[in-house]
Amino acid sequence: KFSKQSWGLENEALIVRCPRQGKPSYTVDWYYSQTNKSIPTQERNRVFASGQLLKFLPAAVADSGIYTCIVRSPTFNRTGYANVTIYKKQSDCNVPDYLMYSTVSGSEKNSKIYCPTIDLYNWTAPLEWFKNCQALQGSRYRAHKSFLVIDNVMTEDAGDYTCKFIHNENGANYSVTATRSFTVKDEQGFSLFPVIGAPAQNEIKEVEIGKNANLTCSACFGKGTQFLAAVLWQLNGTKITDFGEPRIQQEEGQNQSFSNGLACLDMVLRIADVKEEDLLLQYDCLALNLHGLRRHTVRLSRKNPIDHHS
């Protein structure tokens, strides 16, 4: 409970706060746990303690380890642990998972991305922002105080955002970067009772004996990605897979399509080499989600070949 994971990159500033809190008047002693060696408080040291804060200016890979902080008051002592890991800088753009701060979600109404841990540092504007390693440009992006605001958020805005700023300590400047994922939630998403767009109820589909025929069952379920929604065909009240006629197969599209902003699904029923007995079957297009089920029935009728005789 009183242990905190902290991480940073070599040659950047890293400031860690003791996981145990106390009044500003309480003294805090820091130790390197492996050696029990006290961390100095003199600012001339690259790694030094400053009350509740442990400062690495700048950090080195060798600084990795567990640090103990003891908050001392006249009546009690509280011990906390900071598990610090310093990583080498990546040569490529990819930010590994272990360097990522918590994911934040945004929507059209709320699209603030806060720069992680920035409150621990002595920084001044401007705060620089990058998405997937590219500097953000354009009027939709506004760096405001310690957070980024994105106007008119779209699903394409999802990705990894890195903030970069300068920490100042006694006139010396140190760079700091922090990255977190941003996901976009569709606040307007909703689901509704399925609406079948095709086929029409009790539709008669004309087919030619001996030819192939396709029937499409298409239904819409709401706005935004629809979970637990399905369209399927039944033959005489039986699922296609159980009907046992290899000439008749159903094929579903891979993704949800969007019609007028609604999420729709379709399932194509393919009948190869149409036979007379196929005309006797009842074909049901089913659309269902957690709101309920809608069923449209189709029957096949023979299409008379055009008489070409004069």
């Epitope: 637990l228 929604a229 399905a230 399927l232 699922k239 897979t241 159980d242 159903q250 094929e251 579903e252 599209g253 891979q254 993704n255 949800q256 699904l265 089913l286 269902l288 989600n289 957690l290 709101h291 309920g292 089920l293 069923r295």
Partner: nanobody, 120 residues
Framework: EVQLVESGGGLVQPGGSLRLSCAAS????????MGWFRQAPGKEREEVAA????????YYADSVKGRFTISADNSKNTAYLQMNSLKPEDTAVYYC?????????????WGQGTLVTVSS
Amino acid sequence: EVQLVESGGGLVQPGGSLRLSCAASGRTDSTASMGWFRQAPGKEREEVAAISWSGGRTYYADSVKGRFTISADNSKNTAYLQMNSLKPEDTAVYYCARLAFQGNTVFDLWGQGTLVTVSS
């Protein structure tokens, strides 16, 4: 009567992987789709991933895209959720759900849940 039983949850370090299973016992021929949902302490239940029972369509929440994979084995009446590159914010109770129908009636069935904890 159909029952859903989840398994595969547990404690894993950030960056690690887990595979959840959801086995449906009983009559499952009316299954239309299955999905995974999750609920973190103090938060609302949220969708994670879903799959049509024929296996052709999959859906993922933005927060898990590229990391989680849902699949189904119809012969075993089981749905799976392969979770890679796990993050602390993936910590939650994961529930399996089944959408099915009988005649013109739709019913959804939920499992008891399996706890996934991502922590170092």
